[in-house]
């Protein structure tokens, strides 16, 4: 039976050519991690693997950095950034949990004057 | 399997700079960060700052920012942090030790510095 | 920085003896929170990591337990090779932070 839980920082936003972290925890549960993947949509961001380390996908490597912890560094942000977000950590013997998150990326004075969303 | 391999010491004077070394073996030394620690002589542990091979990304503790700096030589596995301005409160041993899914898996048997005239 | 504060700062117990350590976080840390032995002359070993998931080759009479700000490492039926520093460790934000330990003596 799955007992864990996961808690992500929920909706955030951020401003443009700014950072984020991506932070989700997974409680609840004594399962081992073996792997946690984020994804925005379809799209593979990085995979943190108990045997392997970190893999970064080619095409987010200039902008994405691991941690801290489990969590994922997204910088310099684009409008284009905006979406969801997914944590997936595959867990034995409960099997996998999902959280997601969703980033709003803001115009500079936006972000300034009313984001709609407040990072925790 | 994995190995971190540090000196066993360095002895240095005062107001020098030295390079400690921990080469890396058994694991993809890109895809995990390294870490430093210092330990004063019985004492508790000091998060100095980490760095990620991969990119070369860095952090620091802000109280180490002006006395370390760290880099990576993934050619040769291997991970340097160097420290300036050498006093006698610099004198400990300074640990590596790596991080992929579980922070500070791995360590390195430490290198201990001694800062002396 | 999220500082960690051990208690006890030293424990005297007998060898089959059950214990608790304590690390309380000044701010929560959810569930990232690990646990380190080092013995004297030793580099740390890592013996819990997220507050309570077991790590290979470490002895099931360690466990882990807590989330947010208060958490527990438990010895159960202590041996002499447990004895020494029990450090936590926080990896919920730069920069990472230890606890000031927890001296475990034989008694």
């Known amino acids: 039976m799955m007992t864990g839980t996961i808690e992500t920082t929920g909706n955030i936003s951020a401003e443009k050519g700014g950072s984020i972290i991506l932070q989700c925890h997974l409680s609840s549960t004594t399962a081992q991690v073996t792997q946690v993947n984020w994804e925005q949509q379809d799209q593979l961001l990085a995979i943190c693997n108990a045997d392997l380390g970190w893999h970064i996908s080619p095409s987010f490597k200039d902008r994405v950095a691991p941690g801290p912890g489990l969590g994922l560094t997204l910088q310099s942000l684009t409008v284009n950034d905006t979406g969801e977000y997914f944590c997936i950590y595959h867990t034995y013997p409960d099997g996998t949990y999902t959280g997601r998150i969703f980033l709003e990326v803001l115009e500079s004075s936006v972000a300034e004057h009313g984001a709609r969303f407040q990072i925790p | 399997q994995v190995q971190l391999q540090q000196p066993g010491s360095e002895l240095v004077r005062p107001g020098v700079s030295v390079k400690l070394s921990c080469k890396a073996s058994?694991?993809?030394?890109?895809?995990?960060?390294m870490h430093w620690v210092k330990q004063r002589h019985g004492q508790g542990l000091e998060w100095i700052g980490n760095?990620?091979?991969?990119?070369?990304?860095?952090n620091y503790h802000e109280k180490f920012k002006n006395k370390g700096t760290l880099t990576v030589d993934t050619s040769s596995s291997t991970a340097y942090m160097h420290l300036s301005s050498l006093t006698s409160e610099d004198s400990a041993v300074y640990y590596c030790?790596?991080?992929?899914?579980?922070?500070?898996?791995?360590w390195g048997q430490g290198t201990t510095l001694t800062v002396s005239s | 920085d999220i500082v960690l504060s051990q208690s006890p700062a030293t424990l005297s117990v007998t060898p089959g003896d059950s214990v608790s350590l304590s690390c309380r976080a000044s701010?929560?840390?959810?569930?990232?929170l690990h646990w380190f032995q080092q013995k004297s002359h030793e580099s740390p070993r890592l013996l819990i990591t997220y507050a309570s998931q077991s790590i290979s080759g470490i002895p099931p009479r360690f466990s882990g337990s807590g989330s947010g700000t208060d958490f527990t490492l438990s010895i159960n039926s202590l041996e002499t090779e447990d004895f020494g520093m029990f450090f936590c460790q926080q990896s919920n934000s730069w920069p990472y932070t230890f606890g000031g330990g927890t001296k475990l003596e034989i008694k």
């Open positions: 701010q929560s840390i959810r569930n990232n």
């Open positions: 030790s790596r991080e992929g899914l579980y922070p500070f898996d791995y």
């Open positions: 058994g694991y993809t030394f890109t895809s995990y960060w």
């Open positions: 760095i990620f091979p991969g990119s070369g990304t860095t």
